[in-house]
């Protein structure tokens, strides 16, 4: 069952999934000047059996002008965002080491991919939030959102994360929230 809405937006924060539940779809979007190849699938789909999950279909982009052939590539190191360690990143690293049953990992980039990935999430999906660069967590309650089905409708739970650009003294020294990492999350993560 697909989630009706996007995960909630949190002011000055971005969200990221650690892994994607089977049934999740990722649109095959191309950057400006490129389009999906004619025979190409419009989306990738996380599918699996009892032992293994993976993305079905491959996204491929071709130049809108020329009829050049395309290949899937892994980006060069400078194209890959360096990930600093935060509470959320450690969750992600853990998930990278131990594959979650019934989940797919982040699909690798494809050549001339759009900057923004558009996912269609399914019920049971969890996404994690952190403050963007230049902001810190004034309050970090549960900083995740789960797509749940209630009374026949889907609903994302509300993350309890408040990000601020201010620097105010804490009442409890030593319990300030850690500064969000500058490159902790790509801002391109969205869903539809």
């Amino acid at each position: 069952e697909l989630c009706d809405d996007d995960p909630p937006k949190i002011t000055h924060a971005t969200f990221k999934a650690v892994a994607y539940k089977e049934g999740t779809m990722l649109n095959c979007e191309c950057k400006r000047g490129f389009r999906r190849i004619k025979s190409g699938s419009p989306y990738m789909l996380c599918t699996g059996n009892s032992s293994h999950s993976s993305w079905d279909n491959q996204c491929q982009c071709t130049s809108s002008a020329a009829r050049n052939t395309t290949k899937q590539v892994t980006p060069q190191p400078e194209e890959q965002k360096e990930r600093k360690t935060t509470e959320m990143q450690s969750q992600m690293q853990l998930a990278d080491q131990v594959s979650l049953p019934g989940h797919c990992r982040e699909p690798p980039p494809w050549e001339n991919e759009a900057t923004e990935r558009i996912y269609h999430f399914v019920v049971g999906q969890t996404v994690y939030y952190q403050c963007v660069q230049g902001y810190r967590a004034l309050h970090r309650g549960p900083a995740e959102s789960v797509c749940k089905m209630t009374h026949g409708k889907t609903r994302w739970t509300q993350p309890q994360l408040i990000c601020t650009g201010e620097t105010e003294p804490s009442q409890f020294p030593g319990e300030e929230e850690p500064q969000a990492s500058p490159d902790g999350l790509p801002e391109s993560e969205t869903s539809r």
């Epitope: 937006k9 309050h139 994360l161 105010e168 804490s170 409890f172 319990e175």
Partner: antibody, heavy 115, light 107 residues
Framework: QVQLQQSGAELVRPGVSVKISCKGS????????MHWVKQSHAKSLEWIGV????????SYNQKFKGKATMTVDKSSSTAYMELARLTSEDSAIYYC????????WGQGTTVTVSS | DIQMTQSPASLSASVGETVTITCRAS??????LEWYQQKQGKSPQLLVY???TLAEGVPSRFSGSGSGTQFSLKINSLQPEDFGTYYC?????????FGGGTKLEIK
């Protein structure tokens, strides 16, 4: 069920301070930040500030800096707001409200400043 | 600071009617907007959050829409318990600010 129980009405003299409380129950207190809101006839609803119930970190509306001081006592699941140097302008109902979306509010504490 | 302007300031309507209350932000507030209902002598209650998500237990006759600077709250088939004052509030950066309120009265 979620409840925010505020302290009772206060009748105070101008120039003094008052400290009002908001006790959370029916949920994990430190999961939700606590906001304070002023309601007066003159200005409708005004956001005073927010405090992290976990860290004690605060953010104030500039207008209330020096007027309001928010604190929290995790052991008793209680948030406090002290209002200093009271004037008739501070006569209002003060509410606490929890979380990012103010999904639950206290019943309000009426503060009357009168000589 | 972002100023929130609600309109109308008051309106009279009959049970069964549909009404719409609007809220305009002086700057882009994206979808960081809540709607509250307040009855006389009571605390405000959350109706809609993030511009369009209905709070738990709120009847489906209420709906929120809009983003950016223009938002609205629609109440279909008004019920006697819907009368009271409605406030919008943004939470896109501090200070959070509220609209002046819309008083909905029985005609």
């Amino acid at each position: 069920q979620v409840q925010l129980q505020q302290s009772g009405a206060e009748l105070v003299r101008p120039g003094v301070s008052v400290k009002i409380s908001c006790k959370g129950s029916g949920y994990t207190f430190t999961d939700y930040a606590m906001h304070w809101v002023k309601q007066s006839h003159a200005k409708s609803l005004e956001w005073i500030g927010v405090i992290s119930t976990y860290s004690g970190d605060v953010s104030y509306n500039q207008k209330f800096k020096g007027k309001a001081t928010m604190t929290v006592d995790k052991s008793s699941s209680t948030a406090y707001m002290e209002l200093a140097r009271l004037t008739s302008e501070d006569s209002a109902i003060y509410y606490c409200a929890r979380g990012v979306t103010f999904d639950s509010w206290g019943q309000g504490t009426t503060v009357t400043v009168s000589s | 600071d972002i100023q929130m302007t609600q309109s109308p300031a008051s309106l009279s309507a009959s049970v069964g009617e549909t009404v719409t209350i609007t809220c305009r932000a002086s700057e882009n507030s994206y979808s960081y907007l809540e709607w509250y209902q307040q009855k006389q002598g009571k605390s405000p209650q959350l109706l809609v959050y993030n511009a369009k998500t209905l709070a738990e237990g709120v009847p489906s006759r209420f709906s929120g829409s809009g983003s950016g600077t223009q938002f609205s709250l629609k109440i279909n088939s008004l019920q006697p318990e819907d009368f009271g004052t409605y406030y919008c509030q943004h939470h896109y950066g501090t200070p959070y600010t509220f609209g002046g309120g819309t008083k909905l009265e029985i005609k």
